[in-house]
Interface confidence: medium
């Protein structure tokens, strides 16, 4: 099945170049495992073109399939620390609306101090993505060590 | 060549499909932590469509937001080797022009022998990306274990 | 500001939006190191738009450069398990047609329980990608821990 009849064409703009790359702002209070993100040219190399931040969490503005990627590096960490504080786990998921809540991507640190991964997933307008870091170790806020982003790929 | 004949269409070139995937050529002399890359169909599955190599470093030809990705595997490595030679760190950054010098992505090997990550970042025409491997261990030159690439994502 | 004037338009289909994200179905019989994948909205968040599954392996339908990504998490795994069962290795490659057989991406688990990576590679219509997990440990079937996907990037 064709996406569209040949004569039905899309302006390039409407292709939905939604994209965001965020840097860590801070961790949550003690009982809140979420990481809080920030983005914008004034902050350096982070940006939001389409998606928005809602209290430090990323909200999607356009339906489609997205490439979601993340890297989190633990601060004050060695392989010994990481294994001693195991399990330290990072999960990226849709946290609202509640009806669509699901874990999209999950990694444990084991004896490492950095996790990095990416995946394709369908997201809908209004989906809010949360990144939960469980465990007692803190993430590094260096912008080249901890970052989170999404890229719209197709309708 | 255009995707389609009609006059109401964008030439492929104007979409900015700049993309490159490189394989390791060699490491630098003793005081130079940079990895030197190579690419081109004659070498296998590496290629450069837009970006260019300048003395083994990747130079960007089109402004935009890029997905930068890398995987580096250490040669003759076990988790014991990796931890004994710690810290071994890989950093990808803009190394020239000097006014734009910045680290974009950084990972340590800890007890692992491979790092892999990716991130979105704005790059400008003329930016040269360097990949610095610090430590005493050498990278594998196997093309399925060590590679570095960029993909233009949007203006 | 629009990326292009309204009259300069591309048929969506001609952009080659081939994309797939798969979840693990099962492992092969004892002498078969391949992972067998499944995808489709009925299964959750996995999908195939363009590529197809052929006996659990991913077959490409459109020539081009693709971003290939994978994450595999070992089940019932700790860093001790992972190192005791070393080497456990994951390789993604073209397994058919035989004339194009090649390893595209390879990672070992060492003391970790998850590997994740991605790379750009040219693929041709009819290429079948296989993911080989060698070693005695089993992969997790959780859809947020083990997944495999491709995204068409350019011709």
């Amino acid at each position: 099945q064709r996406f569209a009849q040949a004569q039905q064409q899309l302006p390039l703009e409407s292709l939905g170049w939604d994209v965001a790359e965020l840097q860590l702002n801070h961790t949550g209070p003690q009982q809140d495992p979420r990481l809080y993100w920030q983005g914008g040219p004034a902050l350096g190399r982070s940006f939001l073109h389409g998606p928005e931040l809602d209290k430090g969490q990323l909200r999607i503005h356009r339906d489609g399939i997205y490439m979601v990627h993340i890297q989190v590096t633990l601060a004050i960490c060695s392989s010994t620390t990481a294994s001693r504080h195991h399990p330290t786990t990072l999960a990226v998921g849709i946290c609202s609306p509640a009806s669509r809540s699901i874990s999209l991507l999950r990694l444990s640190f084991h004896q490492g101090c950095t996790i990095a991964s990416q995946r394709l997933t369908p997201l809908a307008r209004g989906d809010t993505l949360c990144t939960n870091l469980t465990g007692t170790l803190l993430p590094s806020r260096n912008t080249d060590e901890t970052f989170f982003g999404v890229q719209w790929v197709r309708p | 060549q255009r995707f389609a004949q009609a006059q109401q269409q964008l030439p492929l070139e104007s979409l900015g499909w700049d993309v490159a995937e490189l394989q390791l050529n060699h490491t630098g002399p003793q005081q130079d932590p940079r990895l030197y890359w190579q690419g081109g169909p004659a070498l296998g599955r590496s290629f450069l469509h837009g970006p260019e190599l300048d003395k083994g470093q990747l130079r960007i030809h089109r402004d935009g937001i890029y997905m930068v990705h890398i995987q580096v595997t250490l040669a003759i490595c076990s988790s014991t080797t990796a931890s004994r030679h710690h810290p071994t760190t890989l950093a990808v950054g803009i190394c020239s022009p000097a006014s734009r010098s910045i680290s974009l992505l950084r990972l340590s090997f800890h007890q692992g022998c491979t790092i892999a990550s990716q991130r979105l970042t704005p790059l400008a025409r003329g930016d040269t990306l360097c990949t610095n491997l610090t430590g005493t261990l050498l990278p594998s030159r196997n093309t399925d274990e060590t590679f570095f690439g960029v993909q233009w994502v949007r203006p | 500001q629009r990326f292009a004037q309204a009259q300069q338009q591309l048929p969506l289909e001609s952009l080659g939006w081939d994309v797939a994200e798969l979840q693990l179905n099962h492992t092969g019989p004892q002498q078969d190191p391949r992972l067998y994948w499944q995808g489709g909205p009925a299964l959750g968040r996995s999908f195939l738009h363009g590529p197809e599954l052929d006996k659990g392996q991913l077959r490409i339908h459109r020539d081009g450069i693709y971003m290939v990504h994978i994450q595999v998490t070992l089940a019932i795994c700790s860093s001790t398990t992972a190192s005791r069962h070393h080497p456990t290795t994951l390789a993604v490659g073209i397994c058919s047609p035989a004339s194009r057989s090649i390893s595209l991406l390879r990672l070992s688990f060492h003391q970790g329980c998850t590997i994740a990576s991605q790379r750009l590679t040219p693929l041709a219509r009819g290429d079948t990608l296989c993911t080989n997990l060698t070693g005695t440990l089993l992969p997790s079937r959780n859809t947020d821990e083990t997944f495999f996907g491709v995204q068409w990037v350019r011709p």
Epitope: Q23, L24, H26, T27, Q30, Q38, G40, P41, A42, L43, G44, R45, A75, I76, C77, T136, L138, P139, S140, R141, N142, T143, D144, E145, T146 | A91, G93, S101, I102, S103, R106 | -
Partner: antibody, heavy 122, light 110 residues
Amino acid sequence: EVQLVESGGGLVQPGGSLRLSCAASGFTFSVYYMNWVRQAPGKGLEWVSDINNEGGTTYYADSVKGRFTISRDNSKNSLYLQMNSLRAEDTAVYYCARDAGYSNHVPIFDSWGQGTLVTVSS
Amino acid sequence: QAVVTQEPSLTVSPGGTVTLTCGLKSGSVTSDNFPTWYQQTPGQAPRLLIYNTNTRHSGVPDRFSGSILGNKAALTITGAQADDEAEYFCALFISNPSVEFGGGTQLTVL
């Protein structure tokens, strides 16, 4: 070897301004958060301000908020502190300090300069 | 008034052991305060010794160790040497994004 060298201190009248500089060498400056920490004569240490590695995010101690501005120029491997509306209680040795990058909100200073003395007096 | 408290001065004999403490004016110190210890000799810049309660910074001799003792952070020096004579500052994370330093402990090796 990591080196941090402060300059720009001196005697200034209350209400005046001063700009401190810190020249960094021996490490990849653009990777690290940087800080200013001060020490009044015969007293303890007080954290003043920090700036992230790209220069876009800054934080200040309440005692200097609105009066001091931290900035950096990664191309020159330099950190700055613009001090306006200076008060007698700002008299101190000002140290440039590198954040080890260990934590998302716990500055840990693994390298320090020798300091530059700022005296605010009429 | 200082939020972070330290003994103003302590004395130790060469080869002896001494423990410096770091407390909160109100409340207990835990590892969540990420206690950090710095050493400063006269006319010199401070030097990082211990971070994250008990992790020694690179190059710091193993006679320096950190811990939580009761409701305070502690820096213990075993086998004190003459060149350990210095002022020691502790720093605690109390509120994002700053740290609070203690008033310092002047250690004399006598």
